[in-house]
């Protein structure tokens, strides 16, 4: 009675192909003949699953990275089968938005390029989708802005699709820095004020980051010794009549308002004295 190890051992995948991430995969360990009889089976990678009793291995919720598996049929000796590739298919992984240009801060007017990156996908054929606030923006791997504006700021996501599924990036916040714009001088209580009362001029603007420094100018383009957002004239004099404008500065640059005219008229008392 000649004893010999198990012959022609093969690992057979029982599932229909393709196998998808999350599937339950059943493999059997087959052999042609053995003397003495096969008493146990081994599987590689070792210890990844509970020791299967018969020559059948069930992998619950198969991972995307389960690549190859081999079995051995053992009597007094173990004979190993060639490894089989599970070839698990999975949706794109590790999707993220990456800013290609510029490297650091984004300024209004810049040409900006965002890249939708992913680490791997099986199958490799993918589609891209960009969205902002639920609105589809593009279907390329890159999202390009020729001249970005403050209105383009917001939360962006990209999606990568393959035949198995789709994966979204984390929301990516695009912040646009811009010099003060839309500056205007507002006047309170109005642009016509009686002498002796108070007039407040406010420099209103839109800026990111906010304006850090204001400069006020009169009709002669003479800078006034005031550097806050509000210019308070109290008591206001007839000589204060004229056009005023303001300049706002932030870390990006400067902006200036158009001229606004303040008219200060004489009080009845002054008129009566004349």
């Amino acid at each position: 009675d000649v004893q010999y190890p198990p012959k022609k051992v093969t690992t057979v995948i029982q599932n229909p192909m393709p196998i998808r991430e999350g599937d339950t995969v059943t493999l059997s360990c087959n052999y042609n003949s053995s003397n003495p009889s096969v008493t146990r089976y081994e599987w590689k990678p070792h210890g990844a699953w509970e020791e299967p009793s018969l020559g059948v291995l069930k992998i619950q919720n198969v991972g995307w990275d389960n690549t190859t598996i081999a079995c051995a049929a053992c009597n007094s000796w173990c004979s190993w089968a060639s490894p089989v590739a599970l070839n698990v298919q999975y949706a794109p992984r590790d999707v993220r938005v990456r800013k290609i240009k510029p490297l650091s801060e984004i300024h209004s007017g810049n040409s900006v390029s965002l890249q939708c990156d992913f680490s791997s996908s099986h199958p490799k054929e993918v589609q891209f989708f960009w969205e902002k606030n639920g609105r589809l923006l593009g279907k390329e791997s890159q999202l390009n802005f020729d001249s970005i504006s403050p209105e383009d700021a917001g939360s962006y996501s990209c999606w990568v699709n393959n035949s198995i599924g789709q994966t979204a990036s984390k929301a990516w916040t695009l912040e646009v820095l811009y010099a003060p714009r839309r500056l205007r001088v507002s006047m309170s209580p109005g642009d016509q004020v009686m002498e002796g009362k108070s007039a407040t001029l406010t420099c209103e603007s839109d800026a990111n980051p906010p304006v850090s420094h204001y400069t006020w100018f009169d009709w002669n383009n003479q800078s006034l010794p005031y550097h806050s957002q509000k210019l308070r004239l109290e008591p206001v004099k007839v000589q204060h009549s004229g056009a005023y404008w303001c300049q706002g500065t932030n870390s990006v640059g400067k902006g200036r308002s158009p001229l606004s005219t303040l008219t200060v008229y004489y009080s009845p008392e002054t008129i009566g004295r004349r």
Epitope: P102, L103, S104, H107, G109, S111, S251, G253
Partner: antibody, heavy 115, light 107 residues
Framework: AVQLQQSGVELVRPGASVKLSCTGS????????IHWVKQRPEQGLEWIGW????????EYASKFQGKATITADTSSNTAYLQLSSLTSEDTAVYYC????????WGQGTTLTVSS | DIKMTQSPSSMYAFLGERVTITCKAS??????LTWFQQKPGKSPKTLIY???RLVDGVPSRFSGSGSGQDYSLTISSLEYEDVGIYYC?????????FGGGTKLEIK
């Protein structure tokens, strides 16, 4: 990729003026400010000033007021730095840079002021 | 003008060592601070902006922190290619101002 190409080495006499150039490729210089930075031999970096090529607005560090004049020609996508009344103190490498917080830099122009 | 005081002006460190460089502004700069690396004969290269945001492609061993007036650049484990001069730049106000630089060399 954004690139800034600067003019070559300059050797000039004291008291003279010089105009250095910085040409953008793969981007329009109107997209952001062009900054100029000075680096004297074995020394640190000094910000000279910037220009907004879109409208010609400029801003200078007080130290360089009267010494430096920054201009731009959008038709050739080029910014310039003119330095006047040169002395040995102006011997340095001059860089142009653009975008964000100075993301992209030219290779630098070496200016030597010597008689 | 905002003055940026950088320290140390030069330092030696062992490969694998943790290295920290600091920059102190003469007034608050709202985290508008960039760190550059410059190698001999080369232009500066941006590593970190807005005090703590790593530029894409810069190794993750570089990190930045700080707020208000005090900022720092840390290299978690020094590598040979990290030798060079490091500069901080404040871009909160005009004129832009640089720190004096820190020359980093291997022991």
């Amino acid at each position: 990729a954004v690139q800034l190409q600067q003019s070559g080495v300059e050797l000039v006499r004291p008291g003279a003026s010089v105009k250095l150039s910085c040409t953008g490729s793969d981007f329009n210089i109107k997209e952001d400010y062009i900054h100029w930075v000075k680096q004297r031999p074995e020394q640190g970096l000094e910000w000279i000033g910037w220009i907004d090529p879109e409208n010609g607005d400029t801003e200078y560090a007080s130290k360089f007021q009267g010494k430096a004049t920054i201009t731009a020609d959008t038709s050739s996508n080029t910014a310039y730095l003119q330095l006047s009344s040169l002395t040995s103190e102006d011997t340095a490498v001059y860089y142009c840079a653009t975008y964000g917080s100075l993301d992209y830099w030219g290779q630098g122009t070496t200016l030597t002021v010597s008689s | 003008d905002i003055k940026m005081t950088q320290s140390p002006s030069s330092m030696y460190a062992f490969l694998g060592e943790r290295v920290t460089i600091t920059c102190k502004a003469s007034q608050g700069i709202n985290s508008f601070l960039t760190w550059f690396q410059q190698k001999p004969g080369k232009s500066p290269k941006t590593l970190i902006y807005r005090a703590n945001r790593l530029v894409d492609g810069v190794p993750s061993r570089f990190s930045g922190s700080g707020s208000g007036q005090d900022y720092s650049l840390t290299i978690s484990s020094l590598e040979y290619e990290d030798v060079g001069i490091y500069y901080c730049l404040q871009y909160d106000e005009f004129p832009r101002t640089f720190g004096g630089g820190t020359k980093l060399e291997i022991k």
